[in-house]
């Protein structure tokens, strides 16, 4: 299937303007500068006829403005001014924004918990699975299997750092080297960003809301799959990440620190514990083979134990293993020898919810995964209802340039990396680049942040958290000192050699294009989200790792075809954009594919149909289960009773379509559709109005 | 108290076969292994072997394999060393032994002894 | 099979003396040795058991001491009681082993 969907009648230079052009698609310059225009997005819209595309009538009358639906939107003040009101008024309005900024700040506190709660939830359903990934003995040999194994235990855990302890544990107690132990921390890096993607998914109900927050979440993954992209391979050929840290951690005599100031837990762990708890020693000791953990309970029942070492004597099956020579003896029959152990006994039990209920993990893990959803989804539908009433008009304008807007000149590129550092500072002082990237998300959405802003932000957040790592490893104890420090630092390497790959230079901000992309081809067809996320966190690694235990043979053997199908799909199309006359004609565009291969067109309307059925019996549920209907089906009228997504479709048909503006060079005359562009009045209708 | 009681003196034939029982009372019978020792005129102790009663698991002396048989009759609480192929220098007392210090071979009670004479 | 080597075959002493038996076992057997006693026409008794743990009973004039391969039964003030046979035992390894023993007699 050719990358780029809509390919339907593409001219020569196809790749402008398609919904999914990984390319920052060119604009008409920005005429609202000189109207003193606040919102492009405002801006009318010529309508014109669609013109055959040798014509030059479109380029002479051109629209005034092009909608970009990157463009910030500008949220009105339709409230009365500070100065027009009286006194009462005045202190009304006072307690009212002291009102919203507690309840802003209240669902921001269940937002994190709700993110809390979901990664237990995740450790329940599939933290023995993840557990079991890594007692596979492949993982030394292959280091593609390696990274698939990291991302998929981060996605089953929804936590890095649980995978990332797992593997310093396994490396401490030589299950594993350093070499090995690289491409699953690669991987853990990917599967740490589906949380943030998943956040962005809750924001599906607003076309252009869910473009920016999708786009923005999915950044940070194409980030780390480019990354891994170029880096693994460079790993694996040089072991640079390897040789760098050995150098650094032999260099230094580290004494053992504390451990990192948990900041944002002191104030979140005295709810969650109430919820549940979870014993996450039991996912460390399946992934390192103890039979005996597999049939124990993540769910914690008992908090306060007394553990008491003895020494005991047990029978052994010969003298050979017995501990030493000199405490090995026998009654006559069998052979003993003396073990310290160490006798645990429940004191008292843990104070949640779950604790008398003696629920299989799968059962507490699925109830707290649709809770932990309804709640994260509640809380973000709410949060980007009050800071869209609070970041209206002359607020918003200050937010927004403070934010978004560059140092003066000759110091605008120091910018960017000021954001990393404050991203960088923000998630070591919440202790998760989860929880930083997630709550970054529907403000990318509502607007406050642009994406070109929300990117190094993003890569600052990568830092913070292996700076945790690090300071963690700090804290270990002598045995698991050395390699959960080196392997920290290869965590840290791997993110500053990210960084140089994908930020100093604008022209290799490639993330921000594909993210774009995506992003518009998500905008247009919600279902595609899902697709990306299922195919990219779940199907990839999941075929690579069946394929690397079926043998390297098989892998190379299905995975080299596959590889240089890419690469021509990619060639073809770089051609195609840059120098078509170069390709015979029929390969200047992709007219010679069948339409499913070319365009979401078709597969929407499989979708569609599949979804059919689900159209009416989710009509009258409460407003929060309208996004998750519109994500899934992407259907008009399955929300009937907000009339949101009626209203939406109405608006949409109603509308013409523009022609792009004449600077870009070509005359390919191509729907608003297809350049992933939406009406403005999409951008206002709400669809969880509560 | 703990008494092993042991059958009396036998005269035996080279080849033949020695059974000589070993009756325990005053503890839990299947609870501790219970071993055999012999001494022969003026020598010192050789272990033979032990079974426990419990399960019957036996561990026989490399010496005696493929001689010595130890059984026991858990209704009866007797305990059976049976010794077969018979030669002179099997002449010796025959001490039953019950070991109640758990878990190790010391042996801290003893039957009287039955003293097996092997001649022609 | 450890073979333990017991000294000396045996002595003769004033009641009231201190006597000390040594055993020596031909490998490492940690603590895993007992000490019997035998007197003439008698079963066994046991003394120590674990090297240094007296049985129940016996009189805290025996003493034992020793680890690994040597190993020492001391009866601290020899008593007309105390003339007998001394075994000592390893039960480290199967099969169980006994010293020679050391008679011990009054002059």
């Known amino acids: 299937m050719a990358p780029w969907p809509e390919l339907g009648d593409a001219q020569p230079n196809p790749d402008k303007y398609l919904e999914g052009a990984a390319g920052q698609q060119p604009t008409a310059p920005d005429k609202s500068k000189e109207t003193n225009k606040t919102d492009n997005t405002e801006a009318p819209v010529t309508k014109i006829e669609l013109l055959p595309s040798y014509s030059t009538a479109t380029l002479i009358d051109e629209p005034t403005e092009v909608d970009d639906p990157w463009n910030l939107p500008t949220l009105q003040d339709s409230g009365i001014k500070w100065s027009e009101r009286d006194t009462k008024g005045k202190i009304l309005c006072f307690f009212q924004g002291i009102g919203r900024l507690i309840l802003l700040l209240g669902f921001l506190y269940f937002f994190v918990c709700s993110l809390d709660i979901l990664s237990s939830a995740f450790q329940l359903v599939g933290g023995k699975m993840a557990g079991q990934f890594f007692s596979n003995s492949s993982i030394m040999s292959n280091p593609l299997l390696g990274l698939v194994i990291g991302v998929l235990v981060t996605v089953l855990v929804q936590s890095s750092s649980t995978s990332t302890s797992i593997v310093v544990s396994m490396v401490s107690s030589s299950l594993l080297t350093v070499r090995a132990a690289i491409p699953i921390i690669m991987g853990a890096n990917i599967g740490t960003s589906i949380t943030n993607t998943i956040v962005a998914l809750m924001q599906v109900g607003d076309r252009s809301e869910f473009r920016r927050a999708f786009a923005g979440a999915t950044v940070h993954d194409f980030f780390n799959w480019l990354s891994v992209l170029v880096l693994l391979p460079v790993e694996v050929a040089t072991h640079y990440l390897e040789i760098i840290t050995q150098l650094i951690v032999e260099s230094f005599h580290f004494k053992n620190g504390e451990d990192a100031p948990d900041l944002l837990k002191v104030i979140t762990k005295p709810f969650t514990k109430l919820i549940v708890q979870l014993d996450k020693k039991v996912i460390s000791q399946i992934a390192m083979n103890d039979e005996k953990a597999k049939n124990k309970s993540l769910v914690k029942i008992w908090c306060k134990t007394f553990t008491n070492k003895t020494q005991i004597n047990v029978t052994v099956p010969s003298t050979a293993n017995c501990t030493s020579p000199s405490l090995c003896w026998t009654d006559g029959i069998q052979n003993w020898t003396m073990k310290n152990v160490t006798y645990k006994e429940n004191i008292a039990k843990c104070q949640h919810i779950f604790v008398n209920f003696h629920l299989p993990d799968l059962a507490v893990g699925t109830i707290l995964l649709i809770l932990s959803l309804l709640v994260l989804c509640g809380c973000l539908i709410m949060i980007v209802k009050i800071l869209g009433s609070v970041l209206k008009g002359q607020v918003a304008t200050v937010i927004k340039k403070t934010i978004n807007t560059d140092f003066p000149f000759p110091f605008a590129w120091l910018t960017g990396y000021l954001a990393i550092l404050v991203g960088a500072g923000m998630t070591f002082i919440v202790q998760s680049s989860s929880v930083f990237t997630s709550a970054l998300t529907p403000l990318i959405g509502i607007g406050v942040i642009t994406i070109e802003r929300a990117y190094p932000l993003t890569l600052g957040s990568n830092i913070g958290t292996t700076t945790t790592a690090i300071l963690a490893a700090l804290a270990s104890p002598g045995n698991a000192l050395r390699s959960s420090l080196q392997i920290a630092l290869c965590h840290f390497f791997f993110n500053i050699s990210g960084i140089l790959l994908w930020y100093p230079i604008p022209f290799t901000r490639l993330p921000i294009r594909m993210a774009k992309g995506l992003g518009n081809i998500s905008a247009k067809y919600r279902w595609f989200a899902v697709f990306y996320l299922i195919i990219f966190f779940f199907l990839i690694p999941l075929t690579v790792f069946g394929l690397s235990l079926a043998g390297w043979r098989v892998l190379v053997g299905v995975g080299v075809p596959v590889v240089f199908i890419i690469i021509l799909v990619l060639c073809l199309r770089l051609l195609q954009s840059r120098c078509p006359r170069v390709l015979p004609k029929k390969l200047q565009n992709w007219n010679f594919l069948p339409l499913w291969m070319r365009s979401l067109k078709p597969w929407d309307a499989v979708v569609s149909k599949f979804t059919g059925c689900f159209q009416m019996r989710c009509c009258c549920c409460c407003r929060v289960c309208c996004r998750a209907c519109c994500l899934l089906c992407d259907c008009p009228k399955c929300c009937r009773c907000s009339k949101c997504c009626e209203d939406l479709e109405e608006a949409q048909e109603g509308q013409d379509v523009p022609v792009k503006a004449p600077e870009t060079f070509d005359n390919i005359t191509i729907s608003r559709e297809a350049q992933g562009e939406v009406p403005a009045s999409d951008s206002k209708t709400e669809c969880t109005a509560l | 108290q703990v008494q092993l009681v042991q059958s009396g003196a036998e005269v035996k034939k080279p080849g033949a076969s020695v059974k000589v029982s070993c009756k325990a009372s005053?503890?839990?019978?299947?609870?501790?292994?219970m071993h055999w020792v012999r001494q022969a005129p003026g020598q010192g102790l050789e272990w033979m072997g032990a079974?426990?009663?419990?399960?019957?698991?036996?561990s026989y002396n490399q010496k005696f394999k493929g001689r010595v048989t130890m059984t026991r009759d858990t209704s009866t609480s007797t305990v059976y060393m049976e010794l077969s192929s018979l030669r002179s220098e099997d002449t010796a007392v025959y001490y039953c032994?019950?070991?109640?210090?758990?878990?190790?071979?010391?042996?801290?009670?003893w039957g009287q002894g039955t003293l097996v004479t092997v001649s022609s | 099979d450890i073979v333990m080597t017991q000294s000396p075959s045996s002595l003769s002493t004033s009641v009231g003396d201190r006597v000390t038996i040594t055993c020596k076992a031909s490998?490492?057997?940690?603590?895993?040795v007992a000490w019997y006693q035998q007197k003439p026409g008698q079963s066994p008794k046991l003394l120590i058991y674990?090297?240094?743990t007296r049985h129940t009973g016996v009189p805290d004039r025996f003493t034992g001491s020793g680890s690994g391969t040597d190993f020492t039964l001391i009866i601290r003030s020899l008593q007309p009681e105390d003339v007998a046979t001394y075994f000592c035992?390893?039960?480290?390894?199967?099969?169980?082993?006994f010293g020679s023993g050391t008679k011990v007699e009054i002059k």
């Open positions: 035992q390893q039960y480290s390894r199967i099969p169980l082993t």
């Open positions: 674990w090297t240094s």
């Open positions: 005053g503890y839990t019978f299947i609870t501790y292994n």
């Open positions: 032994a019950s070991s109640t210090i758990i878990t190790t071979g010391a042996v801290d009670y």
């Open positions: 490998q490492d057997v940690g603590t895993a």
């Open positions: 079974i426990y009663p419990g399960s019957g698991d036996t």
